[in-house]
Interface confidence: low
């Protein structure tokens, strides 16, 4: 497999309305026309997909319709957002991204942004 | 219709050089990865290198970078492959071969060959 | 680079015979790897690709398995037309390489 170095934020704390957004940067090898960048998240050594998307260079990323996750690309950056996070939703956000086109294929794994998720406290009861 | 058409049968003597060239129509030249592959008689297939037209960007297998060159002109949609310092090992049918554009790859289409006869 | 070794480098089969033919990279493709067909005189012609998935026209006799360093074409009932020479290729960084070829003769 053909190694390439993806870099993201260690750590990411969430709005309050449950929004988190980092970085995802990877160091192409050659000059990437397709790449797919997929969300995986991690707790409790269980490792998920989140969402992922496949977009041609200078296009904007298209996840699905119902998908909690958008985004944007730059260069080699992408920035991505994921929204309607809880608290239980609180681990290791992996940003893994793959040059699909043209070949050789390459694959980069980042070390994860753990992205920390809080409830808002409810509204007390207000009296009128 | 995808469409290869490639040149001619070709005599060469030892030492010279020869042009191969491979015709595209039927889809948009400009965004596939145009390969060469060869066939020495009874022999196996080799593959030599390839082109990306939009900006002619190259990747050359090493046993052939100091001999081949391979070009393309997007207006006639035709890519080229040259080999230089000819020797009785290069006879051989040349063959172009478009590359899918997606993971995985392939070639799809292929043109009808060219037979080239190094001889003096 | 990564060598293909294919086997057998001959074969010969009877119509209707199921046949199978392997192809063993010197090292991991990820199945990245396509199998084509070749007669006399002619050019190759793609089988399958990605290892598994059969190309357009191919008829569904012709089918694929494997993945790592362990890829298998099988035709599952020979027909006439099918005696030519076989070819395992992988596009896993080029150069891309070929098998040497197995050549499928009549019994």
């Known amino acids: 497999c053909k190694a390439m170095h993806v870099a993201q934020p260690a750590v990411v704390l969430a709005s309050s309305r449950g929004i988190a957004s980092f970085v995802c940067e990877y160091a192409s090898p050659g000059k990437a026309t397709e790449v797919r960048v997929t969300v995986l998240r991690q707790a409790d050594s269980q490792v998920t997909e989140v969402c992922a998307a496949t977009y041609m260079m200078g296009n904007e990323l298209t996840f699905l319709d119902d998908s909690i996750c958008t985004g944007t690309s730059s260069g080699n950056q992408v920035n991505l957002t994921i929204q309607g996070l809880r608290a239980m939703d609180t681990g290791l956000y992996i940003c893994k991204v793959e040059l699909m086109y043209p070949p050789p294929y390459y694959l980069g794994i980042g070390n994860g942004t753990q992205i920390y998720v809080i409830d808002p406290e409810p509204c007390p009861d207000s009296d009128f | 219709e995808v469409q290869l058409v490639q040149s001619g049968a070709v005599v060469a003597k030892p030492g010279s050089s020869v042009k191969v060239s491979c015709k595209a129509s039927g889809y948009s030249f400009t965004t596939y990865w145009m390969n060469w592959v060869r066939q020495a008689p009874g022999q196996g297939l080799e593959w030599m290198g390839m082109?990306?037209?939009?900006?002619?960007?190259?990747s050359l297998n090493q046993a052939f970078k100091d001999r081949v060159t391979i070009t393309a002109d997007k207006s006639t949609s035709t890519a080229y492959m040259e080999l230089s310092s000819l020797t009785s090992e290069d006879t051989a049918v040349y063959y172009c071969?478009?590359?899918?554009?997606?993971?995985?790859?392939?070639?799809?289409?292929w043109g009808q060959g060219t037979t080239v006869t190094v001889s003096s | 680079d990564i060598q293909m070794t294919q086997s057998p480098s001959s074969l010969s089969a009877s119509v209707g015979d199921r046949v199978t033919i392997t192809c063993r990279p010197s090292e991991n493709l990820y199945t990245n790897l396509a199998w084509y067909q070749q007669k006399p005189g002619k050019a190759p012609k793609l089988l399958l690709y990605?290892?598994?998935n059969l190309a357009d026209g191919v008829p569904s006799r012709f089918s694929g398995s494997g993945s790592g360093t362990d890829y298998t074409l099988t035709i599952s009932s020979l027909q006439p037309e099918d005696f030519a020479t076989y070819y395992c290729q992988h596009l896993w960084g080029t150069p891309f390489t070929f098998g040497q070829g197995t050549k499928l003769e009549i019994k």
């Open positions: 990605g290892a598994t």
């Open positions: 071969a478009r590359m899918g554009r997606r993971n995985p790859y392939y070639f799809d289409y």
């Open positions: 082109i990306h037209p939009s900006d002619s960007e190259t």
